[in-house]
């Protein structure tokens, strides 16, 4: 008789990660029997849900089911059916749905509602959909790198899992940008965390952590480039806003409701005497930048340092994983690279920028114009944020990679939601030593 | 106050359906949940489906899926349960009950009265 | 789904005693716990909720305490009418679940 190979004893996880401009479904899977061990956890399936956040879907909550049909379904299927009722499912609404608790807890409440009827139908042990905190966006994904990386196991490896992984056991710090948000998470060198709001304490695997971590509201991509649309119009002298942040020949027309309609531009709010004005792009990467900064307040500080807005930050330590939208902008701009210096960043940067809207319209034909038109903006951002915001530096910049996955899986704060909610990271070093090494091969 | 009054007793034969239905008087419909939970006789009480009716939107508990539909006429505040393949094991009396505190909150504060649903041969 | 367990399934009381309900649940379900009192023949009818805020028209002598994991429903001083069945229910997670009911009798 022919031996019959086991069936695989494994288990699996759905985390739903409900972003402010995009739902993604994450599916993980790990041996059952290694649960405690570290970096066993790992990504099979991405999808990317059809359309906006779920925040925009506040006037049309019973179009939410369909939405998210085709994600749950592919779930269904990647998922063996004898493993349904046993893999948990968890929805984290992010920066967005932040945003439209502001406005109304009610709205965002309906809007949770539904997402949590529609999830509950499917065939799996759902657990609910809640706004994550920005201290837990930046905690998770601090966790999520840093167990992708290793660096949570005690045994130091004479091999590298990633090109850019220190043999140490360091932690790499955590830079997250997405659209309505960006956080900041590190251990900081022998530094008291002045601000209590800021600090938070681990124990993970037997070792002691003291993590530094803030997550900036209204400072996403999106959120900052709204921002900057309403301080710039508060001086525009009629309905031509000139924007260097656009590329020349770019038009666009804005409607001044939805400018508003975000409590991010509240400070910037006035009497306007039009209700649609237009974009013209002008292409100029410095005058961009120096627009950027007028969102960033630094001329208030109550600690020994400050990021911006009276926000603490310790001295920047180690290396940094950036990713999500810092890795997904700088991706496109072909500037993610180990090799890639600041310098030459920032005069990449103003090549692009500078290239007319006909131009890269032409490079970039499978781009939907909508993206295409904001990597001008997106990117300079990116390096305001870094270099003025965090206080990086054209040294320290080398420590900064720019990361999309990690040994398959895609670094974010839903790997690490989902080790917390299993009970997966332990505080104690399991005694049980893994077998083998093979996962990070 | 709100009332939620159910409709009369029904004897059904095996494989059949049973459509129950809920009337709201004196108080918001659409915005809060209904939900339907049967009880055997002597037994404990079961969730069987909810739906808001401002959305049309339902959900089920794993068990009845696929035989249960739960639907709302927003025009006379009336919730339906229908329960289909039905066998003896359905026999148990169905209540409507309003979800009372709103969106996500989802106690029971406003019961129906109850409808006895036979399943006999 | 969320288990709840109630204990014990009959609570044998004279009147003007003290009785004491417990309900567990399998996984935190914070304080979102709903307390329903059912008399034979009748709907149940929601006592507490938020594991421990009376609904509207329920007597002070029915109070629930508990959050997370373990709930209690406490009558202080059992009145004829409290002769009943209790039971408990989480409200956190779909499907909403019950647990089996405790029957409070004359002793």
């Known amino acids: 008789t022919q031996n019959k190979a086991l069936p695989e004893n494994v288990k699996y996880g759905i985390v739903l990660d409900a972003g402010s401009s995009h739902t993604s479904l994450y599916i993980y899977k790990w041996p059952a029997e290694k649960e405690n061990d570290t970096g066993v956890v790992h990504q099979v399936e991405e999808c990317r849900v059809k359309g906006p956040g779920i925040s925009k879907f506040v006037q049309k909550v019973n179009e939410i089911g369909i939405y998210l049909t085709d994600c749950m379904e592919r779930a269904r299927e990647v998922i063996p059916r004898s493993q349904h009722q046993e893999t948990p499912v968890y929805l984290g609404a992010t920066a967005g749905m932040r945003l439209l608790r502001m406005e109304s807890e009610e709205l965002a409440d309906r809007v949770l509602d539904v997402v949590e009827r529609s999830l509950s139908n499917y065939p799996f042990d759902f657990q609910g959909a809640r706004i994550i905190t920005g201290q837990e966006e930046g905690a998770y994904g601090w966790i999520t790198i840093n167990y992708l990386l290793g660096k949570f196991s005690q045994k130091t490896r004479w091999f590298s899992i990633v090109p850019y992984e220190t043999n140490n056991q360091e932690t790499f710090g955590a830079l997250d940008l997405g659209g309505a948000s960006t956080q900041v998470t590190f251990v900081p060198q022998n530094q008291t965390i002045e601000s209590p709001d800021n600090a938070l304490q681990f124990r993970l695997y037997g070792k002691d952590y003291n993590v530094y971590t803030h997550s900036f509201l209204c400072y996403g991509k999106d959120q900052a480039l709204w921002q900057k649309l309403a301080k710039d119009i508060q001086v525009a002298s009629n309905e031509i806003l000139r924007d260097p942040c656009f590329h020349p020949g770019y038009k666009k027309v804005v409607n001044v409701s939805d400018l508003y309609k975000t409590p991010c531009t509240k400070r910037f709010e006035m009497t306007l005497p039009f209700q649609q004005f237009e974009i013209q792009g002008i292409g100029n990467y410095q005058q961009c930048h120096q627009s950027i900064l007028e969102l960033f307040n630094t001329s208030y500080c109550p600690y020994s340092q400050c990021a911006f807005n009276g926000i603490f930050l310790p001295p920047l330590q180690g290396d940094f994983g950036a990713f999500s939208a810092f890795y997904f902008v700088m991706k496109f701009l072909n500037l993610t690279s180990e090799k890639v210096s600041q310098e030459k960043v920032t005069e990449m940067m103003k090549k692009f920028c500078s290239k007319s809207w006909e131009e890269t319209k032409t490079s970039y034909p499978s781009v939907k114009e909508k993206y295409l038109s904001e990597y001008c903006f997106s990117g300079t951002y990116i390096l305001s944020l870094l270099l003025q915001g965090y206080h990086f530096t054209a040294d320290s910049w080398e420590h900064i990679h720019f990361i999309g996955k990690i040994q398959g899986s895609d670094a974010g704060w839903t790997l690490g939601y989902m080790l917390n909610l299993t009970n997966m990271i332990p505080a104690e070093q399991p005694l049980s030593t893994p077998l083998s090494h093979s996962t990070y091969v | 106050q709100v009332q939620l009054v159910q409709s009369g007793a029904e004897v059904k034969k095996p494989g059949s359906s049973v459509k129950v239905s809920c009337k709201a008087s004196g108080g918001t419909f659409s915005k809060y949940g209904i939900s339907w939970v049967r009880q055997a006789p002597g037994q404990g009480l079961e969730w069987m489906g909810s739906i808001i009716p401002e959305f049309g939107i339902a959900n089920y508990a794993q068990k009845f899926q696929g035989r249960v539909t739960i639907t709302a006429d927003e025009s006379t505040s009336t919730a339906y349960m229908e329960l289909s393949s039905l066998r003896s094991e359905d026999t148990a009396v169905y209540y409507c009950?309003?979800?009372?505190?709103?969106?996500?909150?989802?106690?029971?504060?406003?019961w129906g009265q109850g409808t006895m649903v036979t399943v006999s041969s | 789904e969320i288990v709840m367990t109630q204990s014990p399934a009959t609570l044998s009381v004279s009147p003007g005693e003290r009785a004491t309900l417990s309900c567990r649940a399998s996984q935190s379900v914070g304080s979102n716990l709903a307390w329903y009192q059912q008399k034979p023949g009748q709907a149940p009818r929601l006592l507490i909720y938020?594991?421990?805020t009376r609904a509207s028209g329920i007597p002070a002598r029915f109070s629930g305490s508990g959050s997370g994991t373990e709930f209690t429903l406490t009558i202080s001083s059992l009145q004829s009418e409290d002769f009943a069945v209790y039971y408990c229910q989480q409200y956190l997670l779909w499907p909403l679940t019950f647990g089996g009911g405790t029957k409070v009798e004359i002793k």
């Open positions: 009950a309003r979800e009372s505190g709103g969106y996500r909150d989802h106690r029971l504060g406003v």
């Open positions: 938020g594991a421990s």
